[in-house]
Structures are given as C-alpha cells and as structure tokens.
C-alpha cells in the first residue's frame, strides 16, 4: 500500500546491514527489515507462519503509527477497525460495521441510526416546522371579489428535514373554505388578489375547518407543534451570541 517497502534479500546473513533494500536500515535474511531509515514506519507483515519486517512511509490500513524516539512503529488496530487513533479508539470501521464513540458495532444503539455514507452511528433527527404563517386573503379563482364562498390557505416552513429514521414532516400547506362580503369587482380588479377582506361568519352547515392542501397530504407521523416562531429563534440566537465567551489563539 505504501512506498519504500524494504524487503529482505537472498543469500544474506542474519543481522547484516549491507544490501538492505528499500527503506531498511538493518535487515536479516529470515526476518526482513529489522529497523528503518529515518521517518519510515516499521511494521510486521505476516507471511504464512512467519512475520517479516517492512519499512513504510506511513502505516497501512488497519494499523496506527507511534513515533518513538528511536523507532516509528506500526501497531495493529482491533480486528473490526480500518483506521484507529490507538488500540482503544477506532476512527473508521471495516466494511459492515458502524463507528460509534471509537468502537465498531454491527448495529447502532437505540436512539441512533446508521449513516451509510460515513458508516457512523448518528443521532436521529426529527422534522421541525415553523409556526403557521397568516392565512392568505379569501379568494376564488384568484379573485377577492365577485363571489361569496372561496378558499384561503396558509403555509409553514420546514426548519429541519428529518433523517432516515426521523419523524416525517407534517403538512406544510393548509386550505379552508371561507366567505366574503359579496361585492362587485371594480374596474381593473378582475383577477387581482386583494389585501383586505371582510369575512362573514360561516353559514349553518358550512365548514370553516382547515383541511391540509392536497399537495402536502403525505403520510406523516405527528409531531408537537410547539415550535418557536422565527422571531423568537432570532432573538435567542442573538442572546446566545451575547453570552458567548470566546478566546482566540495568541500567535
């Protein structure tokens, strides 16, 4: 995997330095490299029943390097680990395992989900939506005049999209029936959406209940709607910033 692999030479007596190949500083016929040239890492490679010393520019997959004063040495990570910081802490697992707090697991613990891109266990993220925006003007075929019964809609934004195992988002559009003071459209008002409207109480038997927009009637798990509105969120961010105690590096 890495350059500078020092290999043993034939017809060499044990512990003879001359004629070592690649990055070896000292080597033997039987054991290969015994020590490496500066900055190279010494690793033991298993070949059949014996271990051969090799010198590498960096430690191979499944090993981590320690720079001792007299030798740079590669040490094996745990069996299920591809890259590690040391024996205790894995930083990348072998295929089929998920990394969680330095350990390699077959399955992620409860409350976490597998990210198949990073192969790590990550927190489940649920959908978060904003508060509803105000209802739109009561309209019919895009007009706010010349009719009695129309519809009004309201929308809310998705603040946080859910992860694979997270709760799905609830509908983000709602439409309901509404009534307006019947008035004739003025000249030039035809087809225009007005900003103001008078609203009558619904007639007997006429529903004023909100129905989700057909576009947003996806199958969804319910989530609490006790969400902060945008202003509250902004306010909180500003307060958090003001509270921050930050120390910058002195160069």
């Amino acid at each position: 995997q890495n350059a500078s692999r020092g290999r043993r030479q034939r017809r060499m007596h044990p512990n003879v330095s001359q004629g070592c190949q690649g990055g070896c500083a000292t080597c033997s016929d039987y054991n290969g490299c015994l020590s490496c040239k500066p900055r190279l890492f010494f690793a033991l490679e298993r070949i059949g029943m014996k271990q051969i010393g090799v010198c590498l520019s960096s430690c191979p997959s499944g090993y981590y390097g320690t720079r001792y004063p007299d030798i740079n040495k590669c040490t094996k990570c745990k069996a299920d680990c591809d890259t590690c910081f040391n024996k205790n802490f894995c930083t990348k697992c072998k295929s089929g395992f998920y990394l969680h707090l330095g350990k390699c697991l077959d399955n992620c613990p409860e409350g976490l989900e597998a990210n198949n891109h990073t192969m790590e266990c990550v927190s489940i993220v649920h959908c978060e939506v904003s508060e509803w925006n105000p209802w739109s003007p009561c309209t019919k075929k895009g007009k706010t005049c010349g009719f009695k019964r129309g519809t009004e809609t309201r929308v809310r934004e998705i603040i946080q999209h859910p992860s694979a195992k997270g709760n799905l988002c609830p509908p983000t559009n709602e439409t309901r029936k509404c009534t307006v003071q019947r008035k004739k459209c003025q000249k030039g008002e035809r087809g225009k959406k007005g900003r103001e409207r008078k609203r009558k109480k619904p007639n007997k038997g006429e529903s004023k209940e909100a129905i989700p927009d057909s576009k947003s009637l996806e199958s969804s798990k319910e989530i609490p709607e006790q969400r902060e509105n945008k202003q509250q969120q902004k306010k909180r961010k500003v307060q958090d910033k003001q509270k921050s105690v930050s120390v910058s590096t002195v160069h």
Epitope: Y64, T66, R67, Y68, P69, D70, F85, N86, K87, N88, F89, T91
Partner: antibody
C-alpha cells in the same frame, strides 16, 4: 472496570530514594505501554517516563534521565518507578497511566514530597 | 520537543455560556491532539482524541476542532460540573507534551 492503583509515595529528603508501584487490573496490562505523569502542586501535567508493553525499551524526560528507572512485571500486572537522587523539583503527585499515544487510563496518583 | 501553548491560562464564565479554549502546537501535529479535563484532587480524564472525537461518556456539549498547529476545545453551554482545568496534549511523537492548562472558573 479499569483500575490503576499507585503506592509508595511519601516525604523524603533530597538525595534519597523512593520506589513507586502501580497495580493494574481490568485491562490487558501486557498489551499497553505504561507511563508515569507527574503534577507539581498547582502546576500542569508533565510526562516523566514510558516503558513499552514488553519492557524492552524505556524513555525518560531529560530531567530524570540517569536518576529514575522504569520497569514492569507483566506476570504481576505491576509497574515500578525507582527514583534515586531525588530533588526538591521532583515534588509532585505521580500518576501511573496506560500510554497509547494518549493517556487512556489513569491512577488516582501518589504524592511525593522532597524536602529537607 | 513539541511545545504546546494553551490560552487563556484561566477563564471566568457563567452556566450556559459558550466557552472556547485554544491550543497551539510549535509544529504541525496533524490531528494528533488530545484534550483532558481535571477536577481538583482528581486524576485527569480523557475527553477528546484525534482532535475532534469524543470519548465515550463525554457529553455532546464538548467538541474539538483543528488540525496542523491550531486546535480548539469548545463547550457549547457550560454546566456546573464543567468548571475544571483543561489540558491539551500532542500525541504526534515522543516526548509527549502538554499545554500548561486552562482553569475554568465560575464568574
């Protein structure tokens, strides 16, 4: 549960000797390099010495070279620090630690006071 | 030896504050940096390894970042139990060296 228990600390006069021990349990002692890290009163952490897993190599900070000797007995899961020619500046809490690039496991420490 | 310079040496903050401690290495140490927390009369406890990876059992309000020579430990919202002394350590090569520590005190 990983445990490292230091012993052997105490008050000693300058120039005298002291031997610290560290009994390990709860992990494979023979797989780990072991170290001593010290902390003078009100000061920071200072690495003292490390012995590799099989006891074949030892490393010391310059200020203790030639005075301190680190050894281990893997059959007894015990680490030792022989401290000779002690000086006032060696006064500190001495921690035994499993050293694998980071210091993953620590003992509770033993106080060494060098004073006349 | 690689010198590790930590700043500040002490810091006063309140519960709920966001706190940042920095560590500067005298040469490139890649991401071979460890952070420890030490409470009075106790031994140090490993918090973060490989500059940014949380040790098992460490709350997620702790985070580490940086690579090369500049590193940061951040506590997003201080809790009463976080008031302690924090040390960085380079694990790039022997001899292992520590920063001088940052004492985090209640304001």
């Amino acid at each position: 549960e990983v445990q490292l228990v230091e012993s052997g600390g105490g008050v000693v006069q300058p120039g005298r000797s002291l031997r610290l021990s560290c009994a390990a349990s709860g992990f494979t002692f023979s797989d780990y390099d072991m170290a001593w890290v010290r902390q003078a009163p009100g000061k920071g952490l200072e690495w003292v010495a490390t012995i590799i897993y099989d006891g074949s190599r030892t490393y010391y900070r310059d200020s203790v070279k030639g005075r301190f000797t680190l050894s281990r007995d893997n059959s007894k899961n015990t680490l030792y620090l022989q401290m000779n020619s002690l000086r006032a500046e060696d006064t500190a809490v001495y921690y035994c630690a499993a050293h694998d690039r980071s210091f993953d496991y620590w003992g509770q420490g033993t106080m060494v006071t060098v004073s006349s | 030896d690689i010198q590790m310079t930590q700043s500040p040496s002490s810091l006063s903050a309140s519960v709920g504050d966001r706190v940042t401690i920095t560590c500067l290495a005298s040469e490139d140490i890649s991401n071979d940096l460890v952070w420890y927390q030490q409470k009075p009369g106790k031994s140090p406890k490993l918090l973060i390894y490989a500059a940014s990876r949380l040790q098992d059992g460490v709350p997620s309000r702790f985070s580490g970042s940086g690579s090369g020579t500049d590193f940061t430990l951040t506590i997003s919202s201080l809790q009463p139990e976080d008031f302690a002394t924090y040390f960085c350590q380079q694990s790039y090569k022997y001899l292992p060296t520590f920063g001088q520590g940052t004492k985090l005190e209640i304001k």
